[in-house]
Amino acid sequence: NFMYSKTVKRLSKLREYQQYHPSLTCVMEGKDIEDWSCCPTPWTSFQSSCYFISTGMQSWTKSQKNCSVMGADLVVINTREEQDFIIQNLKRNSSYFLGLSDPGGRRHWQWVDQTPYNENVTFWHSGEPNNLDERCAIINFRSSEEWGWNDIHCHVPQKSICKMKKIYI
C-alpha cells in the first residue's frame, strides 16, 4: 500500500513537468530507494541544479523568457565550482547570457532569482564591467584569462544558459 501511494505521488509529480519536459533523467539520491532526483533530458546536473545550454541566439530578455517557459531562469552562478562545471559544456568561440543584469545602468548588478550580488563571488574578466550602456552579463572565453564575465548590450542576441532546481520525486 505504501509503495503504491508513493508511486501514485511520483506519477502525478511527473505529470506536472510533462508539458515542458516530456523526458526526465533520474538518479537515486543516497542509499534510500525512495528518493530520486531528476533533470529534464538532455539537461546536465550539478549538485542540486539542472543546466541547459541554449544554442539559439536571442536577446537577454528573450533568453530569460525562454528559460522561464521551461521552468528555469538564466543561470545564477554562486561558486567557482559551479562555474567550472558549467564551462565544461560551453564552446570557446561563443558567448552565453547569465542571469545577471544592471537594468538601471547604475552598476547595481542583480541576479534574476534575487540572489544577493556578492562582489567577492564574481568572475569578471579584468577591466570588466566597463560600460554603463552595457547592462547584461555574458560568460565568454578570452585566451589570456580563460573563462570570465563581460558586460554587453542586452539586445544583442547571444546563446544562453538556463538553470533550474532538480526535480525530486
Epitope: S59, T61, S101, G104, N131, D133, C136, H155, V156, P157
Partner: antibody
Framework: EVQLLESGGGLVQPGGSLRLSCAAS????????MSWVRQAPGKGLEWVST????????YYPDSVKGRFTISRDNSKNTLYLQMNSLRAEDTAVYYC??????????????WGQGTTVTVSS | DIVMTQSPDSLAVSLGERATINCKAS??????????VNWYQQKPGQPPKLLIY???NLESGVPDRFSGSGSGTDFTLTISSLQAEDVAVYYC?????????FGGGTKVEIK
C-alpha cells in the same frame, strides 16, 4: 547642444568603397554608444551598425555584415563607417545617432542631418 | 527578426482633430513591465526625431499632445489635437532585440 555632422557620402560604382565620418560635439563622445541608420530614397529606416563607447563591441544586421565596419576615434570625437563591396541597394541617406539605454532596450535620441550615398554605374 | 507593421500607411486629419497610428510587433517586445518600442517623427528633408520611448514615455521637449500606449505586440501613437507642424512621417521601432527594426512609416497630412 548635441551636434552630429556626417560627411563622406557621394557617388560610387557597385563593388566600390566609401568611408563615412560623423563628427560629434556638445557631449562626452567617449562615453556614448553610437549607431548608424540609413534610409533608402522614399523608403523607411534601417539600422546599419552600433559600436560601444570603447569601440571593442560592434554589431551589424545580416544585410551589411562582412561588408561594413563601424569604428570610432574618441580622441577626435569621430565615428566612422567603412563600406566595402557596395551594392545598388546600399544607396541611401546615412545618419549617425547617439544611443541611450532604456532598461534592457535603447533609444536613438540625437541624429545628424545625414550624408547621401549613391551606388550606381 | 522582429517585424514591425504600421497602419495606416497614410492618414489625413483635420487641424485640431485626433490622429491615431498603430504598430504591431511580430512577437512580444515586453519584459518586466517595460515595452521596448519607440516612436520617431520625420519631417520632409530632416532626420528622425525621438518622440516616445518605452511605448509611453514622452521624450523631453516633445509637446504633450503626443502620447504612446500599448504593450506586448500592439502599440499606438496618438496626436490628441493635430497641429500644422505635425505633418510628417511617423515610425515605430523595437529595441528589444537586434536587429533593431522599424515600421514602414505612417504619413500624416492635413485634411
Amino acid at each position: 547642444e548635441v551636434q552630429l555632422l556626417e560627411s563622406g557620402g557621394g557617388l560610387v560604382q557597385p563593388g566600390g568603397s566609401l568611408r563615412l565620418s560623423c563628427a560629434a560635439s556638445g557631449f562626452t563622445f567617449s562615453t556614448y554608444t553610437m549607431s548608424w541608420v540609413r534610409q533608402a530614397p522614399g523608403k523607411g529606416l534601417e539600422w546599419v551598425s552600433t559600436i560601444n563607447s570603447g569601440g571593442d563591441n560592434t554589431y551589424y544586421p545580416d544585410s551589411v555584415k562582412g561588408r561594413f565596419t563601424i569604428s570610432r576615434d574618441n580622441s577626435k570625437n569621430t565615428l566612422y563607417l567603412q563600406m566595402n563591396s557596395l551594392r545598388a541597394e546600399d544607396t541611401a541617406v546615412y545618419y549617425c545617432a547617439t544611443y541611450r539605454p532604456y532598461y534592457y532596450g535603447s533609444v536613438l535620441d540625437y541624429w545628424g542631418q545625414g550624408t547621401t550615398v549613391t551606388v550606381s554605374s | 527578426d522582429i517585424v514591425m507593421t504600421q497602419s495606416p500607411d497614410s492618414l489625413a486629419v483635420s487641424l485640431g482633430e485626433r490622429a491615431t497610428i498603430n504598430c504591431k510587433a511580430s512577437q512580444s517586445v515586453d519584459y518586466d513591465g517595460n515595452s521596448y518600442v519607440n516612436w520617431y517623427q520625420q519631417k520632409p528633408g530632416q532626420p528622425p526625431k525621438l518622440l516616445i520611448y518605452g511605448a509611453s514615455n514622452l521624450e523631453s521637449g516633445v509637446p504633450d499632445r503626443f502620447s504612446g500606449s500599448g504593450s506586448g505586440t500592439d502599440f499606438t501613437l496618438t496626436i490628441s489635437s493635430l497641429q500644422a507642424e505635425d505633418v510628417a512621417v511617423y515610425y515605430c521601432q523595437q529595441s528589444d532585440e537586434d536587429p533593431w527594426t522599424f515600421g514602414g512609416g505612417t504619413k500624416v497630412e492635413i485634411k
